[in-house]
């Protein structure tokens, strides 16, 4: 069916519309465009004959209508009257005829809207503010923004006159934001620039700060005043009722008992008209001149140097007082103070010893305290350590390797590889590596006012495929019930999926085992001598898959319960009585047999010949573990029978 | 069981480009490292490139470079060789393969490969 | 990139023989891997790590070597172990493989 698509069906007015015919028909003689919803001659606009390829202007055509021979239609400079019914008539060679219709809309581009606003500086909780957006346009919506967003819902705000004009009511200074409105039409949208609403407020009651009242006669007095206000409030300053000056802060240097007194801010907004004040007592006390702390060596050296603290100045019959990280002095053979406790001294400092110290002097007012001192304690440098703690490193990544070894004053870092200076810095960085840049890699870290070094060494190794792995322990013989077992899956590498595997099987779920570390790293908890197995780790990259050797767990543990074997505890006299003990344990335990209580031998097996009656009694079998630190024991009755 | 199922045999006309598929079975790809290597009739494997399905990451052969994209889909459990600009050179057997351990030990999975013809 | 070069590049050996193929490194790799391929068949990892039998390989075989220097031996060839065989190295990208060596039973 012959159709007309309208490209755009909403035109800009000075724009251009398409009429897009669908499903001309074959075999066409020629067509014709009228303006409207039928054929009529005097509303044709063009019409167009396929043999001679000619294009006819009829009475509507405007000379901005252009036809193509698959009898679409353009219209250019678009207009307001061009909004409406497009008819196109179809004659095929058959002489038969088709029609179809197609419309569009044409609305103007729409100017840039402004506000308008019928109070510019409305007054906080009194005030209303009506703004509108200019100018009036049909067939236009109305959208307003506040910083920014769509507007809040809030029974303050109210959209009238079709969302052209927006209300506050009773204004608050939180209202104070930026404002736009938008036009929006069928073919255009519009912002306003912002209108920034400055609402009148205040002033709020002042602050006086600091809080601070009591004061010492020699400081110095410096107030400041602030009330939320704008516009921003004039200040005027009084002590006890006298007027002093007119700024946001009172200043008196060198204050005595004398400037003790009630001390009033007063606010006021000119534009408001509104006044509030503020009082504040202060009272200003006689006070003895401030303590301060004096050093013997201001740069000591850790495990070399001892420090003597003293503060000063010395007043008779006063006591001293010291905190260390504002903590009362603690109990430590390396601190020591003087009779009167003005002195302490610090024997063989360490770097956790710079403090800060203070030292006070008590009086019947107050403690007063020095200004903190910090020790500098020079110390290290200690080994260094170089990060990331990868060994293994694919070819073409970065090498980006830091040291960094604990220091003061900080370390200066060097770089060897293969024992080969490279570079004076913290961090050593090469870009796109290849094996060729395996090797060792050195950190040299110096403290120049202490003149020692330190150095670390790691071995980097640059290859896509990963090594056969090994498995580390922190502990080789743990003891059961009692120790934990940390394997770690070696070397560490970047990119690397850790596996492990128990006497060739995945690993059982449990409690006691935990992966940490990226799955590098397998613990056992609280071990227990079935634990004594086999561990595998595997690993994995893009183009490797490696098993480590077995790691077997030996577990300590033991001794058990003993059990003395054989079971009888009736003999007859004469006969041979050999007893032999038993305990599981890790390693062998030691034996050793007690008779009525009577040590016997250190022996696993006790054996005594032609028994008699007086071998009656009891036999105490004694297991005991080195290893562990354990033992036990049990006890059997034996009774021979003449 | 472990099966990597590879796309069917291609005619292709040079100049064109073509896209292989290798659907993995009995595990996960998103686990593993995909790798494609290219055989020519009667010569030896030559390695193109390998991807990692979890987050797209790959590492090509220079060769390969602008030739060989590699691609993966996790919800399909399929991974993807598209091979570009194509001439005769491009006529072999492509074979995805991959690393795994299945249990205990490490083993390595191939396609059945897929042939691709390129006619001018 | 690390060239592999394999030799021979073809021989026969009798059912029992030993057979030995090398594979010689242009630059020193981690470890050498050996694929076995057949007619018509895609390649199977026959020797991991220079040393490891894959799953499902005679014991006949065996792989050694280190730095540049590998070889495949088989203590007794069997006709089942005719196919070619491709050395492969993972160390440095990109991966190469051998020319590969064609084994036939005579």
């Known amino acids: 069916k012959l159709t007309i698509e309208s490209t755009p069906f909403n035109v800009a007015e000075g724009k251009e519309v398409l009429l897009l015919v669908h499903n001309l028909p074959q075999h066409l003689f020629g067509y014709s465009w009228y303006k409207g919803e039928r054929v009529d001659g005097n509303r044709q606009i063009i019409g167009y004959v396929i043999g001679t390829q000619q294009a006819t202007p009829g009475p509507a055509y405007s000379g901005r209508e252009i036809i193509y021979p698959n009898a679409s239609l353009l219209i250019q400079n678009i207009i307001q009257n061009d909004t409406g019914f497009y008819t196109l008539h179809v004659i095929k060679s058959d002489l038969v005829n088709e029609e179809a219709t197609g419309q569009f809309r044409v609305y103007p581009e729409l100017p840039k809207p402004s506000i308008s606003s019928n109070n510019s500086k409305p007054v906080e909780d009194k005030d209303a503010v009506a703004f509108t957006c200019e100018p009036e346009t049909q067939d236009a919506t109305y959208l307003w923004w506040v910083n920014n967003q769509s507007l809040p819902v809030s029974p303050r705000l109210q959209l009238s006159n079709g969302n052209r004009t927006l209300t506050l009511f009773n204004v608050t200074r939180n209202d104070t934001a930026s404002y736009k409105c938008e036009t929006q039409n069928p073919v255009s949208a519009r912002r306003s620039d912002s209108v920034i609403l400055n609402v009148l407020y205040g002033p709020d009651a002042p602050t006086i700060s600091p809080l601070n009242t009591s004061y010492r006669s020699g400081e110095n007095l410096n107030l400041s005043c602030h009330a939320a206000s704008n516009p921003p409030a004039q200040y005027s300053w009084f002590v006890n009722g006298t007027f002093q000056q007119s700024t946001q802060e009172l200043f008196i240097p060198n204050i005595t008992v004398n400037n003790s007194g009630s001390y009033t801010c007063q606010a006021h907004n000119s534009d408001t008209g509104l006044n509030r004040t503020t009082v504040t007592t202060i009272t200003v006390y006689a006070e003895p001149p401030k303590p301060f702390i004096t050093s013997n060596n201001s740069n000591p050296v850790e495990d070399e140097d001892a420090v003597a603290l003293t503060c000063e100045p010395e007043i008779q019959n006063t006591t001293y007082l010291w905190w260390v990280n504002n903590q009362s002095l603690p109990v430590s053979p390396r601190l020591q103070l003087s009779n009167d406790n003005r002195t302490l001294t610090l024997l063989s400092v360490t770097r956790n010893d710079v403090g800060p110290y203070e030292c006070g002097i008590q009086n019947e007012l107050s403690v007063d305290h020095s200004d903190p001192v910090i020790l500098n304690v020079l110390y290290g440098p200690d080994d260094p350590t170089i990060s990331p703690s990868y060994t293994y490193y694919r070819p073409g990544v970065n090498l980006s390797l830091s040291c960094h070894a604990a220091s003061n004053p900080p370390a200066q870092y060097s770089w060897l590889i293969d024992g080969n200076i490279q570079q004076h810095t913290q961090e050593l960085f090469i870009s796109n590596i290849t094996e060729k840049n395996s090797g060792l890699y050195t950190c040299q870290a110096n403290n120049s006012a202490s003149g020692h070094s330190r150095t670390t060494v790691k071995t980097i190794t640059v290859s896509a495929e990963l090594p056969k792995p090994s498995i580390s322990s922190n502990n080789s013989k743990p003891v059961e019930d009692k120790d934990a077992v940390a394997f770690t899956c070696e070397p560490e590498a970047q990119n690397t999926t850790y596996l492990w595997w128990v006497n060739g099987q995945s690993l059982p779920v449990s409690p006691r085992l935990q992966l940490s570390n990226g799955n590098r790293t397998l613990t056992l908890f609280n071990v227990t001598r079935n634990d004594a197995r086999a561990y595998v780790c595997g690993i994995q990259n893009s183009v490797s898959a490696n098993r480590s050797d077995p790691v077997t767990l030996d577990v300590l543990y033991g001794p058990d319960t003993p059990i003395i074997s054989p079971p009888d505890s009736s003999y007859l006299s004469g006969a041979n009585l050999n007893l032999s003990c038993h305990s599981a344990s890790n390693p062998s335990p030691q034996y050793s047999w007690r008779i009525n209580g009577i040590p016997q031998q250190h022996t696993q097996v006790l054996f005594i010949a032609k028994i008699t009656p007086n071998n009656n009694g009891t036999y105490a079998c004694f297991v005991s573990n080195l290893a562990t630190g354990r033992n036990n024991s049990i006890v059997k009755s034996i009774t021979v029978s003449a | 069981e472990v099966q990597l199922q590879q796309s069917g045999a291609e005619l292709v006309r040079s100049g064109a480009s073509v896209k292989l598929s290798c659907t993995a079975s009995?595990?996960?790809?998103?686990?593993?490292?995909m790798h494609w290597v290219k055989q020519r009739p009667e010569q030896g494997l030559e390695w193109i490139a390998w991807?990692?399905?979890?987050?797209?990451?790959?590492e090509y052969a220079p060769k390969f470079r602008g030739k060989a994209t590699l691609t993966a889909d996790s919800s399909s459990n399929t991974a993807y060789l598209h091979l570009s600009s194509l001439t005769s050179e491009d006529t072999a057997v492509y074979y995805c393969?991959?690393?795994?351990?299945?249990?205990?030990?490490?083993?390595?999975?191939w396609g059945q490969g897929t042939s691709v013809a390129v006619s001018s | 990139d690390i060239e592999l070069t394999q030799s021979p590049a073809i021989m026969s050996a009798s059912p029992g023989e030993k057979v030995t193929i090398t594979c010689s490194a242009s630059?020193?790799?981690?470890?050498m891997h050996w694929f076995q391929q057949k007619p018509g068949t895609s390649p199977k990892l026959w020797i991991y790590?220079?040393?490891n039998l894959a799953s499902g390989v005679p014991a006949r075989f065996s792989g050694s070597g280190s730095g540049t220097s590998y070889s495949l031996t088989i203590s007794r060839m069997e006709a089942e172990d005719a196919a070619t065989y491709y050395c492969?190295?993972?160390?440095?990208?990109?991966?190469?493989f051998g020319a590969g060596t064609k084994l036939e039973i005579k």
């Open positions: 393969h991959v690393l795994i351990y299945a249990g205990y030990l490490a083993m390595d999975y």
């Open positions: 009995g595990f996960n790809i998103k686990d593993n490292y």
């Open positions: 991807i990692d399905p979890e987050n797209g990451d790959t």
């Open positions: 630059s020193s790799v981690t470890y």
């Open positions: 790590s220079t040393s």
């Open positions: 492969q190295q993972r160390s440095t990208y990109p991966l190469t």
